[in-house]
């Protein structure tokens, strides 16, 4: 490790004085940064030697003394303090900059270590410093402002007192950047716009940033627009603003618009699209099919698309019947907007009844016409299912006729015994019916169909049942020939 | 909620001193700065001065250097105000006032304490 | 110390109209756009209220009917539509530099 001569830590000389500062290594070694011209500087052997003949107070300050061959890396400080009565401050800088919530050095040094208890920090022109400035003092390195604040950026003096008067340095102005987290924050608004031919139109684009060096500008399609900038400060935030107002918007005028801003750590750009229209224009559509089957006690929701500029001027939910002329209660209609042209709306049919089915019709108006898009919507019922006895032609015949919809198939089987319902094990044969008649089919009704099982003798001891199927589910009747007649039963559910 | 308790009214004589109460709940106590303000008929409202709880640093409005002393008790967040030689100049009531502290440097006092009336009579 | 000097004393004002408040500084109060000037709302009986932060900043729970602006040395607190609750004295206050400063108040009656 180097040693400097004299020993120090500190040296407090007059002005005018010679100062010799010899440093002695074992190797060669060097002072520390730039050294000012008032200084001489030669080698002796290992040792390096500064020279003044003439000491002023701005010679005041802390020199340091390295060993680069030195593997510790090791070094040997002095701080030379030149007390000069008029000037009780060498300041080593007239601007400091540094970041938010860094510490910041305000490097004036006290030429006279005996004046330490006198010093304080204070504004340009003897202003307080900022409610809250929190700071330290080093005779050595000069005040320090903890981690300082933008608002703390201001023009600094550094005073001391003597002879019972303030002395004040030279100022230094501190400078205190915003960290900046990233490119400025935009707004584009609208997201969209549409506009019939001939009317005006406003895009705005906004940018906001941390500090106030950051640009901005709209662009359409590829070219930048020339627009004025307005500039503003809320929120701790920097705002510029730029408003593009068209009176009256053509063809040339659709298109893509950008909003891009940038700063030192970036771009960032957000887009909107502008389609020019001749006319009004509503449209509607579902992704729903728009006939719909559902089985009877559950629920639908028919959901509507609406496209729509300008904006709607009414809407609502129509049913057209067949069955009766309730209305959808307006409880059960929702609408949400996607965004500033599309709609969806909604008509929610909990636990359908069977006076339910029919068509359901959404109008909506603006001032392109009104537009109607129609559901039909059908219940599925499972079959039910009843047979008689009856004679056709002279011939004894049981009639089976069962309802549902879908349209029911029909399967007859006799089995032995006597019993409410075929099983698997008894059944003795089986008939399909592949073309059972239709008796009624109406729009939005369960569809009857009958069939019939012509038998010449029935034979006593034995079962014939009806049975009926669809997509929803299955019923049956069950025969049973008797002496005296003949008897019919129902299955139990 | 954040409420600063004060301690009750004082009716002191002349001459005499008094210590005011402040405990603050439902706040970090120690991010803040706790002020004390004097409120009196003639004078309107005026800052005594504050403390910064996490290492009772104070500081003071030189017209109440030498009359008021603040202190406070991290264990128990509470911060006293003492004042001494007290003349009917000092019958006031006496708020403590928490200041917050925000990036941007807004100091403000947003939640104050209900007031400390203090009566200064022989 | 930074003097601020509120006007008017005392104001009165028809219920839904609007009141406006005036505190002038003795010296500048603001720096690098931040202005440093706070209002507070004092009903009798009761300690004082934060209402606005930063000349323009409303405190969170205030409602919307109180405004402020203002820069450097001049600043308002505006109040639009008065309500019969909004009687109260209303003060101003720095933060800029030690020692912290208050207006003489303003008081408003509701007519």
């Known amino acids: 490790i180097p040693v400097i001569e004299p020993s120090g830590p500190e040296l407090v000389v007059k002005p005018g004085e010679t100062v010799t500062l010899r440093c002695v290594g074992n190797g060669s070694v060097e002072w520390d940064g730039p050294i000012s011209p008032h200084w001489t500087l030669y080698s002796d052997g290992p040792s390096s030697v500064l020279t003044t003949n003439n000491a002023t107070f701005q010679n005041t300050r802390t020199y340091r003394c390295t060993e680069p061959g030195d593997p510790l890396g090791g070094s040997a400080a002095i701080h030379l303090y030149v007390k000069d009565p008029a000037r009780p401050w060498n300041v080593l800088a007239k601007e400091v900059v540094v970041f938010e919530d860094q510490d910041a050095l305000l490097p004036c040094l006290l030429t006279d270590p005996v004046l330490e208890a006198g010093v304080s920090l204070v504004r340009l022109r003897g202003r307080p410093l900022l409610r809250h400035t929190n700071y330290s003092f080093s005779p050595w390195h000069g005040f320090i402002i903890h981690r300082a604040k933008f608002i703390q950026g201001q023009d600094y003096q550094c005073s001391a007192l003597m002879g019972g008067r303030k002395v004040m340095s030279i100022s230094i102005r501190l400078k205190v950047q915003k960290v900046i987290p990233g490119p400025p924050a935009l707004t584009l608004v609208p997201a969209e716009l549409v506009r019939i031919r001939g009317e005006a139109a406003q895009i705005v684009c906004s940018a906001s940033n941390i500090d106030v060096d950051f640009d901005v500008f709209l662009q359409h399609n590829t070219t930048k627009l020339a627009i004025p900038q307005r500039s503003d400060f809320h929120d701790n935030r920097y705002q510029k603003v730029l408003t593009l107002s068209l009176g009256q918007v053509d063809f040339q005028h659709a298109g893509n618009y950008s909003c891009v801003a940038s700063n030192v750590q970036g771009k960032h750009s957000t887009s909107m699209f502008f389609q020019v229209v001749e006319s009004a224009y509503l449209d509607l559509s579902s992704e729903q099919n728009l006939i719909q089957e559902v089985t009877v006690g559950e629920g639908l929701n028919l959901k509507v698309m609406v496209e729509a500029y300008p904006g709607l001027q009414g809407f609502n939910w129509t049913y057209l019947g067949p069955f009766s002329d309730h209305q959808p209660e307006p409880k059960l209609a929702n609408a949400t907007t996607k965004d500033t042209y599309r709609h969806t709306f909604t008509l929610s049919l909990p636990r359908l009844k069977p006076s339910e089915a029919g068509r359901y019709s959404f109008l909506a108006r603006n001032p392109g016409g009104w537009r109607a898009l129609t559901f039909e919507l059908t219940l599925r019922y499972p079959p039910e299912v009843s047979v008689i006895w009856t004679s056709i032609n002279g011939s004894g015949t049981l009639l089976c006729a069962a309802s549902g919809y879908p349209q029911p198939n029909v399967t007859w089987l006799q089995c032995a015994g006597h019993t409410d319902r075929c099983d698997e094990a008894q059944v003795l044969q089986v008939w399909v019916d592949p073309h059972p008649e239709v008796l009624s089919q109406e729009p939005f009704q369960k569809v009857t169909v009958q069939s019939l099982l012509t038998a010449e003798t029935l034979e006593h001891n034995q079962t014939y049942e009806c049975r009926a199927h669809n997509s929803v589910g299955s019923g049956s009747w069950a025969f049973i020939p008797i002496s005296a007649g003949a008897r019919t039963h129902p299955p139990d559910e | 909620e954040v409420q600063l308790q004060q301690s009750g009214p004082e009716l002191v004589k002349p001459g005499a001193s008094v210590k005011i109460s402040c405990t603050a709940s439902a706040i970090t106590f120690t991010d803040y700065y706790m002020n004390w303000v004097k409120q009196s008929p003639g004078k309107g409202l005026e800052w005594i001065g504050d403390?910064?709880?996490?290492?009772?640093?104070?500081t003071y409005n030189q017209k109440f250097k030498g009359k008021a002393t603040l202190t406070v008790d991290k264990s128990s967040t509470t911060a006293y105000m003492e004042l001494r030689s007290l003349t009917s100049e000092d019958s006031a009531v006496y708020y403590c006032a928490r200041e917050k502290i925000t990036m941007e440097y807004y100091y403000a006092m947003d939640y104050w304490g209900q007031g400390t009336s203090v009566t200064v009579s022989s | 110390d930074i003097v601020l000097t509120q006007s008017p004393a005392s104001l009165a004002v028809s219920l839904g109209q609007r009141a406006t408040i005036s505190c002038r500084a003795s010296?500048?109060?603001?720096?690098?756009?931040?202005?440093?000037i706070h209002w507070y709302q004092q009903k009798p009986g009761q300690s004082p209220k934060l209402l606005i932060y930063?000349?323009?900043s409303l405190e969170s729970g205030v409602p919307a009917r109180f405004s402020g602006s203002g820069s450097a040395t001049d600043f308002t607190l505006n109040i639009h539509p008065v309500e019969e609750e909004d009687a109260a004295t209303y003060f101003c206050?720095?933060?800029?530099?030690?020692?912290?400063?208050f207006g003489g108040g303003t008081k408003l009656e509701i007519k």
């Open positions: 930063a000349a323009s």
């Open positions: 206050q720095q933060s800029i530099e030690d020692p912290p400063t």
């Open positions: 010296e500048s109060v603001s720096s690098h756009d931040i202005h440093l």
């Open positions: 403390i910064y709880p996490n290492n009772g640093g104070t």
